[in-house]
């Protein structure tokens, strides 16, 4: 079977500062030199793109400056960090990997990571 398998953790809890990190690992059926990684959010049956980056194997993963994602790559493993999350952003985050070059193209879609985000309690007013 020449399909590409993508693995990611089932559940991640965001930090109190709204930061969530997880590893997206793919089993490459070919020797790709150019890879595109996309983080998708699935809510009900709607899928939206959170962020995307294309990188050359051996080089760093670079998201756009205004992206809420950062990441590093090592071999067939990508360490993804999503920032600025709030409770309303709780949901299923899917890692999508595409082997763009050289041919053939391969698509790999993970089962998704359920990210739970809990907004921090506001600090109580204190008297000095």
């Amino acid at each position: 079977c020449k399909a590409m398998h993508v693995a990611q953790p089932a559940v991640v809890l965001a930090s109190s500062r709204g930061i969530a990190s997880f590893v997206c690992e793919y089993a490459s059926p070919g020797k790709a030199t150019e890879v595109r990684v996309t983080v998708l959010r699935q809510a009900d049956s709607q899928v939206t793109e959170v962020c995307a980056a294309t990188y050359m194997m051996g080089n760093e993963l670079t998201f756009l400056d205004d992206s809420i994602c950062t990441g590093t790559s090592s071999g067939n493993q990508v360490n993804l960090t999503i920032q600025g999350l709030r409770a309303m952003d709780t949901g299923l985050y899917i890692c999508k990997v595409e082997l763009m070059y050289p041919p053939p193209y391969y698509l790999g879609i993970g089962n998704g990571t359920q990210i739970y985000v809990i907004d921090p309690e506001p600090c109580p007013d204190s008297d000095f």
Partner: antibody, heavy 118, light 108 residues
């Protein structure tokens, strides 16, 4: 609403050229891979070509390789298919289709007919 | 190249009956990358099922998909008059993208 509209089809002689266009609206065009799929009269669907995101990566079906060129202009939200050295067997309805985030072709244009005949 | 073979070529059924369409792949296809499309005469194809079993937006629940490996099935539980059409399976996990030859569901 999300829409794809093809244009540029017509009747052309063998060996001549034709350029098809596909105007996209209602979505962020540059975030999607875009395909051309064709259907000869009374036949099934045949994938023709794909172009990804920024337009650098393209793939073609063997029967059209070296003759057809797929391109896109993200500033104009438009997909193109330049067809050269046309053959009788290229006669078909040509559809542009969007590759959805999960890979399947979720949005299709209405199609444009290309007839290659002397 | 992954070759998809659909059967039967034509299915003659009456409204209200159950339709079972088959799609067989020449090599194993991950179920994440198998889709079904419906096409009516003079119209563009319409996505019904993606990921072998997930219904696309707006598709009624009488349509369901199943299968894994090399064998996939599209089931229409109770045929409505508007369901008589040609159905295509497709794999989109690797290039080249390929379609089955189609199954025509016609009124008996």
């Amino acid at each position: 609403q999300v829409q794809l509209v093809e244009s540029g089809g017509g009747v052309v002689q063998p060996g001549r050229s034709l350029r098809l266009s596909c105007a996209a609206s209602g979505f962020t065009f540059s975030s999607y891979g875009m395909h051309w799929v064709r259907q000869a009269p009374g036949k099934g669907l045949e994938w023709v070509a794909v172009i990804w995101y920024d337009g650098r990566n393209k793939y073609y079906a063997d029967p059209v390789k070296g003759r057809f060129t797929i391109s896109r202009d993200n500033s104009k939200n438009t997909l193109y298919l330049q067809m050269n050295s046309l053959r009788d067997e290229d006669t078909a309805v040509y559809y542009c289709a969007r590759a959805g985030y999960l890979g399947a072709f979720d949005i299709w244009g209405q199609g444009t007919m290309v007839t290659v005949s002397s | 190249e992954i070759v998809l073979t659909q059967s039967p070529g034509t299915l003659s059924l009456s409204p209200g009956e159950r339709a079972t369409l088959s799609c067989r792949a020449s090599q194993s296809v991950s179920s994440s990358y198998l889709a079904w499309y419906q096409q009516k005469p003079g119209q563009a194809p319409r996505l019904l099922i993606y990921g072998a079993s997930s219904r696309a937006t707006g598709i009624p629940d009488r349509f369901s998909g199943s299968g894994s490996g090399t064998d996939f099935t599209l089931t229409i539980s109770r045929l409505e008059p508007e369901d008589f059409a040609v159905y295509y399976c497709q794999q989109y996990g690797s290039s080249p993208w390929t379609f089955g030859q189609g199954t025509k569901v016609e009124i008996k």
